[in-house]
Interface confidence: low
Amino acid sequence: QDVVDLDFFTQQPLHLVSPSFLSVTIDANLATDPRFLIFLGSPKLRTLARGLSPAYLRFGGTKTDFLIFDPKKESTFEERSYWQSQVNQDICKSGSIPPDVEEKLRSEWPYQEQVLLREHYQKKFKNSTYSRSSVDMLYTFANCSGLDLIFGLNALLRTADLQWNSSNAQLLLDYCSSKRYNMSWELGNEPNSFLKKADIFINGSQLGEDFIQLHKLLRKSTFKNAKLYGPDVGQPRRKTAEMLKSFLKAGGEVIDSVTWHHYYLNGRTATEEDFLNPDVLDIFISSVQKVFQVVESTRPGKKVWLGETSSAYGGGAPLLSDTFAAGFMWLDKLGLSARMGIEVVMRQVFFGAGNYHLVDENFDPLPDYWLSLLFKKLVGTKVLMASVKGPKRRNLRVYLHCTNTDNPMYKEGDLTLYAINLYNVTKYLRLPYPFFDKQVDKYLLRPLGPHGLLSKAVQLNGQTLKMVDDQTLPPLMEKPLRPGSSLGLPAFSYSFFVIRNAKVAAC
């Protein structure tokens, strides 16, 4: 019973996801003290970000609605030092952060991280201002890493009658126009909880009107075709779903995609068992369905994006969200999102406070980074269907796409299967006719070292994954399997399998 037969549906794609399907975020809280945005000047961090291109980089989060642009604000000493060090360089071939500045910021970061997490848990948010330098830092990081920046504007700037006050946004738009910064926009973050965060209640219809106002501003700016995404609501519980519905009725016409957020767990209470529980993974399905119900009943056919998502909210689950164990949730969410028609999934966060980052405070990639990198290289935009034959197989989760056609190793018509084994025994997957005798390349991820699933290091087909140097990612080496053999998937592991020469016409 450890041999499992698979079923494929390959006649036509179920969905077509964006080439930027797997995207990332930088939490707006990184700008609370704008000096820490200098971290984005790290060549190593940029190398890692480039590995995930094409992707969106969303700058947003709770702090979005507590940040105010001040074009007259002076840069800090650290920011001036950074820009001074870059003066004679090609902006994208940046030298490193000045060593004294980096050392100072690194030593202060643990304290700053605690400040940010405490602010989040206590739900006491203070307004902060950011300067032109902060905008430059963000845009340069995105642009030099091949990422498309999406900037979240403060939606809590209100007139006396609760209309959105767009004057601060206008200042930022004017600055970005002057610099020829080409980016997309959002307005507000999780407006469903404004009452809790700021004692202000904004209903969906009002928010829709606010988006219409922002849309008009964008049409008047240099970038008439700038995209606008929203409303970045939280999970679709009853009141949030109602808010989304009334927002879409009022303002849905002016947004390019509908954005919402999802977390499985509370980071403070999550356990290792939760991270490996198929019941927990399955709750995502009903959340997606509810969002689609609302969208289809108000703006049929409008694209749906996960605008912010991770394993656990509140910065993630300590000792879990940054380990190999987090990959089960991340890969399953990517698979389900693609299968269910979500066009883009934005991972909270690429780099920043908490435990759910892809890259840690030393700019070292964590297991979910390597998983994301493999996904980018192997998984294409055309979504097919794989399923496990037989009942009660939720511990074995399989997803199927056409292979990424940008990968020079593979060709059109090839298939990428990715699979998650939550059983405590190895499972052997058998491909269906006519694929069972094809050449298959295996990319198996396993944790490295004594910490097992809680390891922060990972092996690909038995080889430890680490950067060659700050400018170079390692080759991702396949393991060719003997044609006709079953695909072994060890207990509590995940893997990609590329089926070569599959000749699937839909691909």
Epitope: S286, Q293, E296, G301, L336, R339, G341, P391, K392
Partner: antibody, heavy 123, light 112 residues
Framework: QVQLVESGGGVVQPGRSLRLSCAAS????????MHWVRQAPGKGLEWVAV????????YYADSVKGRFTISRDNSKNTLNLQMNSLRAEDTAVYYC????????????????WGQGTTVTVSS | YIVMTQSPLSLPVTPGEPASISCRSS???????????LDWYLQKPGQSPQLLIY???NRASGVPDRFSGSGSGTDFTLKINRVEAEDVGVYYC?????????FGQGTRLEIK
């Protein structure tokens, strides 16, 4: 294996009530929408009602609206159809069917059917 | 609601010969996602209906490849390229685009 088994049919007088049940097994019941479809003797198929995976939405054919109620108990993997104010024209074999739209909530179709239970409304 | 009309209502066929059933809807079944929300079902004598084709042209699991569905918008066709004795029964088309869900009247396929 995936299975749906209807029960609760029988002979009942016009104006009376009857409750049909459908027991599901072999799949994650709580992830799927479920339908009732009926077939009068010698006639074609007629859709009766659908309920979404979580019970949040229910839709009915005009011919049964206000008289029939579809419900589900996800903890017991059971689908129900409460039929009140029965009429002679409700005489039919009643089938429950699974909606494959677990990943496309708006897809109404039936990929698995039960064997049916017969309801006869007669005085 | 959407009215589904099938033709012919009766279809006698010689084994090994092809068969074709037409289904027309009173409004388009093409969803904004590019799929036609039309299914074909077969009800064999004394049995429950079974799904043959979903979303206009996709064969359901376990359905022989002699069955195929085609069409878009309002006009759809179910083809059997070589009828076998086990294919007898009543074939129904059904629109799955919106509630109330509606079926065609059925086409009875019998062996000559």
């Amino acid at each position: 294996q995936v299975q749906l088994v209807e029960s609760g049919g029988g002979v009942v007088q016009p104006g009376r009530s009857l409750r049909l049940s459908c027991a599901a097994s072999g799949f994650t019941f709580s992830s799927y929408g479920m339908h009732w479809v009926r077939q009068a003797p010698g006639k074609g198929l007629e859709w009766v009602a659908v309920i979404w995976y979580d019970g949040s939405n229910k839709y009915y054919a005009d011919s049964v609206k206000g008289r029939f109620t579809i419900s589900r108990d996800n903890s017991k993997n059971t689908l129900n159809l409460q039929m009140n104010s029965l009429r002679a024209e409700d005489t039919a074999v009643y089938y429950c069917g699974r909606d494959p739209g677990t990943y496309h909530y708006y897809y109404h179709g039936m990929d698995v059917w039960g064997q049916g239970t017969t309801v006869t409304v007669s005085s | 609601y959407i009215v589904m009309t099938q033709s012919p209502l009766s279809l006698p066929v010689t084994p090994g010969e092809p068969a074709s059933i037409s289904c027309r809807s009173s409004q388009s079944l093409l969803h904004s996602n590019g799929y036609n929300f039309l299914d074909w079902y077969l009800q064999k004598p004394g049995q429950s209906p079974q799904l043959l084709i979903y979303l206009g042209s996709n064969r359901a699991s376990g359905v022989p490849d002699r069955f195929s569905g085609s069409g878009s918008g309002t006009d759809f066709t179910l083809k059997i390229n070589r009828v076998e004795a086990e294919d007898v029964g009543v074939y129904y088309c059904m629109q799955a685009l919106q509630t109330p869900i509606t079926f065609g009247q059925g086409t009875r396929l019998e062996i000559k």
